[in-house]
Interface confidence: medium
């Protein structure tokens, strides 16, 4: 969904799948004004590594193609718009 | 010019514990993983652990958890390792070395220049 | 665990000879890294993710291979270039290789 709406203090999961065999897989956050700013990054499966702001999240890669972030507790702070990325 | 600067050499009995240090300068402390690698005569070097100094955030290789904690100040940019229940095993030269990305991957671009422990009775 | 097997332990070579050092992994890496350690120093990075050279390095280095076997290449030894050599991969948690120690004769 393009749209998530969730209460402050819920755990929530982002999901992000690639078809395409990249190995590096990123999470980053938009804000106006902030630009992209990166989250979380993986290089390979269970290889997660801390981008630029990384607090308050957590990630998950069991899978090449998977890339999950986790909000493990919602705050009115994580409100963005989060994209995902992929590449070689 | 980035450096990381470690403590002096050690000798401890035994049973005792060690804690070794590594002063970062010339980059944001914070915002690298530091890691802390054993290097044994004719034994190869031995990935121990790493900090994120940012959050306190620690990997330990299962071979030293338990036995190796690390800490690290963010206000003076110094890396800890502490080893308790020393023993003869533990004698070898110990060094810090940052996490720099290349195409996204973690290398250890920087190192300290070492610590050497003797463990002895 | 990934296990890297470095040979020959030991490489005695000739001033301006070419050689090659290898590494091979017990299960597929995506990359690999090299580090020298000349005696009574910390190691330096020498080449990353396989086969880029590191800040510094001179071009005599370079580096190649895929999946469980990789290589590094000295293409005119010189003096300086006698030290100890690792390789070093990270998948799940870092491991090195047992090393090569480069003599020149």
């Known amino acids: 969904s393009r749209y998530l709406v969730k209460r402050t203090g819920e755990k929530v999961f982002l999901e992000c799948v690639q078809d395409m065999d990249h190995e590096n897989m990123f999470w980053y956050r938009q804000d106006p004004g902030l630009g992209l700013r990166l989250i979380y990054f993986s290089y390979d499966v269970k290889m997660k590594e801390k981008g630029d702001i990384p607090e308050g999240y957590s990630v998950s890669r069991e899978k090449k193609e998977r890339f999950s972030l986790i909000l493990e507790s919602a705050s009115t702070n994580q409100t963005s718009m989060y994209l995902c990325a992929s590449s070689l | 010019q980035i450096q990381l600067q470690q403590s002096g050499p050690e000798v401890v009995k035994p049973g005792a514990s060690v804690q070794i240090s590594c002063k970062a300068s010339?980059?944001?402390?914070?915002?690298?993983?530091m890691n802390w690698v054993k290097q044994r005569p004719g034994k190869g070097l031995e990935w121990i652990g790493r900090?994120?100094?940012?959050?306190?955030?620690?990997d330990y290789s299962g071979k030293f958890k338990g036995r190796a904690t690390l800490t690290a100040d963010k206000s003076s940019s110094t890396a800890y390792m502490r080893l308790s229940s020393l023993t003869s095993e533990d004698s070898a030269v110990y060094f810090c070395?940052?996490?720099?990305?290349?195409?996204?991957?973690?290398?250890?671009?920087?190192w300290g220049q070492g610590t050497t422990l003797s463990v002895s009775s | 665990q990934i296990v890297l097997t470095q040979s020959p332990a030991i490489m005695s070579a000739s001033l301006g000879e070419e050689i090659a050092l290898t590494c091979s992994a017990n299960?597929?890496?995506?990359?690999i890294h090299w580090y020298q350690q000349k005696s009574g120093t910390s190691p330096k990075l020498l080449i990353y993710?396989?086969?880029n050279l590191a800040s510094g390095v001179p071009s005599r280095f370079s580096g190649s291979g895929s999946g469980t076997f990789y290589s590094l290449t000295i293409s005119s030894v010189e003096a300086e270039d006698a030290a100890d050599y690792f390789c070093?991969?990270?998948?799940?948690?870092?491991?090195f290789g047992g090393g090569t120690k480069l003599e020149i004769k």
């Open positions: 010339g980059y944001t402390f914070s915002g690298s993983w």
């Open positions: 070395a940052r996490s720099g990305y290349f195409n996204y991957v973690p290398v250890f671009d920087y």
């Open positions: 070093h991969q990270w998948s799940f948690y870092p491991t």
């Open positions: 993710t396989t086969s």
């Open positions: 900090i994120y100094p940012g959050d306190g955030d620690t």
């Open positions: 299960s597929t890496v995506g990359y």
